[in-house]
Interface confidence: low
C-alpha cells in the first residue's frame, strides 16, 4: 500500500533560540530579550528566570537556555533546579520553625542543612563505643567488649569540637 | 596545594583592550567560584565580578557590567578576564582570588600573585 | 550596594601593644548563624591575605594574636600583641550579597 506523506510542519524547522511566528506566517522569529526556548519547533518562548532577592544567578539566561540560580550565602537550595533556598545552620544544628536549635543529646548533624540524626548505637553490632558522639559528631564504634584487651579502655575522650568556618590550625 | 597563576604585566593604550589569564591548579577548577579583585596604585581592593566555571555563570559590579566580560577554559581550567575601552584610571594590578563555596560560604581563600595592567598614551 | 567604612585610616602601635580596627557595614551582614564579614592582610607587592572569616574565625596558620569580633554592622579585628611582621594594610569584605565590597583599608604601623 502506498504510505500517506503528511505535510511538514513548517515550525520544525525553527531552532532552540527561536519561535515559530504566527504572525508572520510562520516564519522563524528570534527569542525576544528575556526569553528562551531550549528545543526546536516551539510557537512560543519561555520566560526566562529571573533569580533575585535570595537566589542569585548561578548561570545566565540565554536564548537557548533558562537562567539558573543558587543561593546567596547563609542559604542552600532546596527542590528540583534550586526552587527554594533555606537558611543554613550550624553544624551541630538544625533548622525548626523557630530557627535554627542545637541538636538534642543523643542526636548530631554534621552538616550546615538538615536534621539532627541519632548516634550509631554501637551495642546493635556488638561493638563499644571508641569516640563519644557530639552535636557535630557521631559516635565511632570499636570493637566488641570482648575484643579488648585486659585493662583497655572502651572509651576515648572525643576530639574537640569545631566551629564550623574554622579551619584545622 | 591550590595556585593561581596569572599572566604577566602589560601596557596598553587607551581605548584599548586587555585580557589577563589565570591558571589554576591543584583543585577542580569547575566546583568553586573565581572572583576578579583591582587595585589601583596606593589605593584600596575593588571587587569586580566572578564566574562559576562549571556553568559560565557570571556576576558583574555594576561599575564594570559594560566594559568587563569574564570566561573560563575549563579545559586548561583557566580563568579570564577582559577589559574593554581602557582608561588611564584602569591603571592598576588585577588580581583573581578563588572562593571558598564550601557549603554556600564565600571568602576569598586563594589569590593569585597579580597583574599589572597600565594604561598610557 | 554595602559601603563598607574602616577606621582608623592608619594606627601607629608600639611593638607588643595591642592594635584595634574597626569596620562598619551600611546594613547588617549577619544571620543568627553567622556574620559574613572577612578581614584581610595586604603586605606591599604582595596580594591580600585572608585573616579571619566570618567575623571571628580564624584561617589556618594565622598567629593566635590576630582576633576578630563582631556582629550586625559593626566588626573589629585586634592583634592583641603587635609584632615586626605585621606592619601591613588590613581590609574588611563583605560577603553578604552581590557585589562584594571592600573597606578602604587601614595602614598598621610600628610608632
Known amino acids: 500500500f502506498e504510505r500517506t506523506r503528511s505535510l511538514q510542519d513548517p515550525c520544525s524547522n525553527c531552532p532552540a533560540g527561536t519561535f515559530c511566528d504566527n504572525n508572520r506566517n510562520q516564519i522563524c522569529s528570534p527569542c525576544p530579550p528575556n526569553s528562551f526556548s531550549s528545543a526546536g519547533g516551539q510557537r512560543t518562548c519561555d520566560i526566562c528566570r529571573q533569580c533575585k532577592g535570595v537566589f542569585r544567578t548561578r548561570k545566565e539566561c540565554s536564548s537557548t537556555s533558562n537562567a539558573e540560580c543558587d543561593c546567596t550565602p547563609g542559604f542552600h537550595c532546596l527542590g528540583a533546579g534550586c526552587s527554594m533556598c533555606e537558611q543554613d545552620c550550624k553544624q551541630g544544628q538544625e533548622l525548626t520553625k523557630k530557627g535554627c536549635k542545637d541538636c538534642c543529646f543523643g542526636t548530631f548533624n554534621d552538616q550546615k542543612r538538615g536534621i539532627c540524626r541519632p548516634w550509631t548505637n554501637c551495642s546493635l553490632d556488638g561493638k563499644s563505643v571508641l569516640v563519644n558522639g557530639t552535636k557535630e559528631r557521631d559516635v565511632v564504634c570499636g570493637p566488641s567488649p570482648a575484643d579488648l584487651s585486659p585493662g583497655a579502655s572502651s572509651v576515648t575522650p572525643p576530639a574537640p569540637a569545631r566551629e564550623p568556618g574554622h579551619s584545622p590550625q | 596545594e591550590v595556585q593561581l597563576v596569572q599572566s604577566g604585566a602589560e601596557v596598553k593604550k587607551p581605548g584599548a583592550s586587555v585580557k589577563v589569564s589565570c591558571k589554576a591548579s591543584g583543585y577542580t577548577f569547575t566546583s568553586y567560584w573565581m572572583d576578579w579583585v583591582r587595585q589601583a596604585p596606593g589605593q584600596g581592593l575593588e571587587w569586580m565580578g566572578n564566574i562559576y566555571p562549571d556553568s559560565g555563570g557570571t556576576n558583574y559590579a555594576e561599575k564594570f557590567k559594560s566594559r568587563v566580560t569574564l570566561t573560563v577554559d575549563t579545559s586548561i581550567s583557566t580563568a579570564y578576564m577582559e577589559l574593554s575601552r581602557l582608561r588611564s584610571d584602569d591603571t592598576a594590578v588585577y588580581y583573581c582570588?578563588?572562593?571558598?563555596?564550601?557549603?554556600?560560604?564565600?571568602?576569598?581563600?586563594?589569590w593569585g600573585q597579580g597583574t599589572l595592567v597600565t594604561v598610557s598614551s | 550596594d554595602i559601603v563598607m567604612t574602616q577606621s582608623p585610616d592608619s594606627l601607629a602601635v608600639s611593638l607588643g601593644e595591642r592594635a584595634t580596627i574597626n569596620c562598619r557595614a551600611s546594613?547588617?551582614?549577619?544571620?543568627?548563624?553567622?556574620?559574613?564579614m572577612h578581614w584581610y592582610q595586604q603586605k606591599p607587592g604582595q596580594p591580600p591575605k585572608l585573616l579571619i572569616k566570618?567575623?571571628?574565625n580564624l584561617e589556618s596558620g594565622v598567629p593566635d594574636r590576630f582576633s576578630g569580633s563582631g556582629s550586625g554592622t559593626d566588626f573589629t579585628l585586634t592583634i592583641s600583641s603587635l609584632q615586626a611582621e605585621d606592619v601591613a594594610v588590613y581590609y574588611c569584605?563583605?560577603?553578604?550579597?552581590?557585589?562584594?565590597?571592600f573597606g578602604g583599608g587601614t595602614k598598621v604601623e610600628i610608632k
Open positions: 546594613q547588617s551582614v549577619s544571620t543568627s548563624s553567622y556574620s559574613y
Open positions: 566570618y567575623a571571628s
Open positions: 582570588a578563588r572562593e571558598e563555596a564550601l557549603g554556600g560560604y564565600y571568602e576569598l581563600t586563594y
Open positions: 569584605q563583605h560577603s553578604w550579597e552581590i557585589p562584594y565590597t
